[in-house]
């Protein structure tokens, strides 16, 4: 019997192709030279190994670069990617745009993983910030990918990224990260017009101030219950009966189903009764 | 995942044919890999061949020419065609479903034994 440790003759590897899916695994360690592998990574996705045969390949090409992989490997992992380490990835360094959507690509429709993570932290350290492409990129992927950066993560993100962010993408963020999404987004929409700005500007309200909600209900945007209910309660509370009525334009008939409710509730305590009652609402103070 | 169920397994001349039929309890047509093993007597377990989602059929060296799978999605059924059977090909046959990527999975089967034998 041959030994385990010798390549059989004639199955020395000349390429990566299908017929390797049938070497065993200690053929597959003894028959592919790793430089080989890592020459041809691009076929090895197209290749449907089993994930034992594909620790074997990740070994080998542990073996080769020891200090991580470079980014012409890293392009091509493919389902290899899935058998990475956090502590694999850590010594990566992603730099293309290209490699993190074939990474991605692999993981899509799925939560982000560990790996995926780690991934996204060493890419956008890398480049030093969110640039617009970047954030594009990973919100298409995760559309809650802006709302999991810390707030200090968050100010690294330029004015400009703001304009690939989706209403959706802020879904899941705090207060605390949409006051600092906010002024980015004001600055970033500042040269529109009234209603395009409003409309671009709704998502990020969260974290505006109460003198841009005293500005914005001078400009008959008819801000819906929605978004109203999503103000910071110490930007509301300053408003009058009438900035409020301004603001909300016809919706302002919705401030009745929601009375018992942050931040409406501090803000109907905080008027006169008699402002109270020109809204014809029966609210009580 | 599906549960696989193999059929049509038996005793057979060499230079005989056979064909294999396997079930699976659900839909397979996005599964990305469809096979089949086989082990033969006091051997470990080898791949024989497999189908890809859109049927293409790769093959063991050994078996080229003589063995053909076919996959239908449709009626969620694996077939493998043995033709000019050798006393080699003997053992027990394993369908085989395997998922790719992210949620990946692999079922089997409970086995067919083939006999190939004069």
């Known amino acids: 019997e041959v030994e385990k440790t010798a390549c059989p003759s004639g199955k020395k590897a000349r390429e990566i192709d299908e017929s390797l899916i049938f070497y065993k695994k200690w053929e597959l360690e003894a028959c592919v030279d790793a430089a080989l592998l890592a020459t041809q990574m691009d076929r090895v996705n197209a290749i449907p190994f089993t994930y034992e045969q594909l620790d074997v390949l990740k070994h080998k090409l542990d073996e080769l670069y020891p200090q991580g992989y470079p980014e012409s490997v890293i392009q091509h992992l493919g389902y290899l990617f899935l058998k990475m380490s956090p502590e694999d990835i850590r010594k990566w360094n992603v730099t293309s745009l290209e490699t993190l959507k074939a990474l991605l690509e692999v993981n899509k429709g799925h939560e982000m993983s560990p790996q995926v993570a780690t991934l996204i932290d060493r890419f956008v350290k890398g480049r030093g910030q969110l640039d617009k492409d970047t954030l594009d990129t990973l919100t298409a992927f995760y559309p809650g990918y802006l709302c999991s950066l810390s707030p200090e993560e968050l100010s690294s993100v330029p004015p400009s990224s703001i304009w690939a962010v989706r209403p959706q993408d802020l879904d899941t963020c705090d207060p605390r990260q949409l006051d600092v999404l906010y002024p980015k987004a004001r600055l970033a929409f500042q040269n529109m017009n009234g209603s395009e700005y409003f409309v671009k500007i709704q998502s990020f309200l969260g974290g505006a101030p109460t003198e841009d909600l005293k500005a914005l209900s001078q400009q008959n945007v008819s801000m819906d219950l929605a978004t109203f209910m999503k103000l910071r309660t110490d930007a509301v509370l300053p408003l009058t009966v009438a900035e409020v009525q301004k603001l909300l334009g016809p919706h302002v008939e919705g401030l009745k189903a929601e009375e018992r409710h942050r931040p409406v509730r501090d803000w109907i305590l905080r008027q006169r009764q008699d402002d109270l009652d020109t809204l014809g609402l029966g609210l009580q103070g | 995942q599906v549960q696989l169920q193999e059929s049509g397994g038996g005793l057979v001349q060499p230079g005989g044919s056979l064909r294999l039929s396997c079930a699976a309890s659900?839909?397979?047509?996005?599964?990305?890999?469809m096979g089949w093993y086989r082990q033969p007597p006091g051997n470990e377990r080898e791949l024989i061949a497999i189908a890809n989602m859109t049927g293409t059929g790769v093959y063991r060296d050994t078996v080229k020419g003589r063995f053909t799978i076919r996959r239908d999605n449709a009626k969620n059924m694996v077939y493998l065609q043995m033709n000019n059977l050798k006393s080699e090909d003997t053992g027990v046959y394993y369908c085989?479903?395997?998922?790719?990527?992210?949620?990946?999975?692999?079922?089997w089967g409970q086995g067919t034994q083939v006999t190939v034998s004069s």
């Open positions: 085989h479903a395997r998922q790719l990527g992210v949620g990946s999975f692999e079922s």
């Open positions: 659900g839909s397979i047509s996005k599964i990305a890999i």
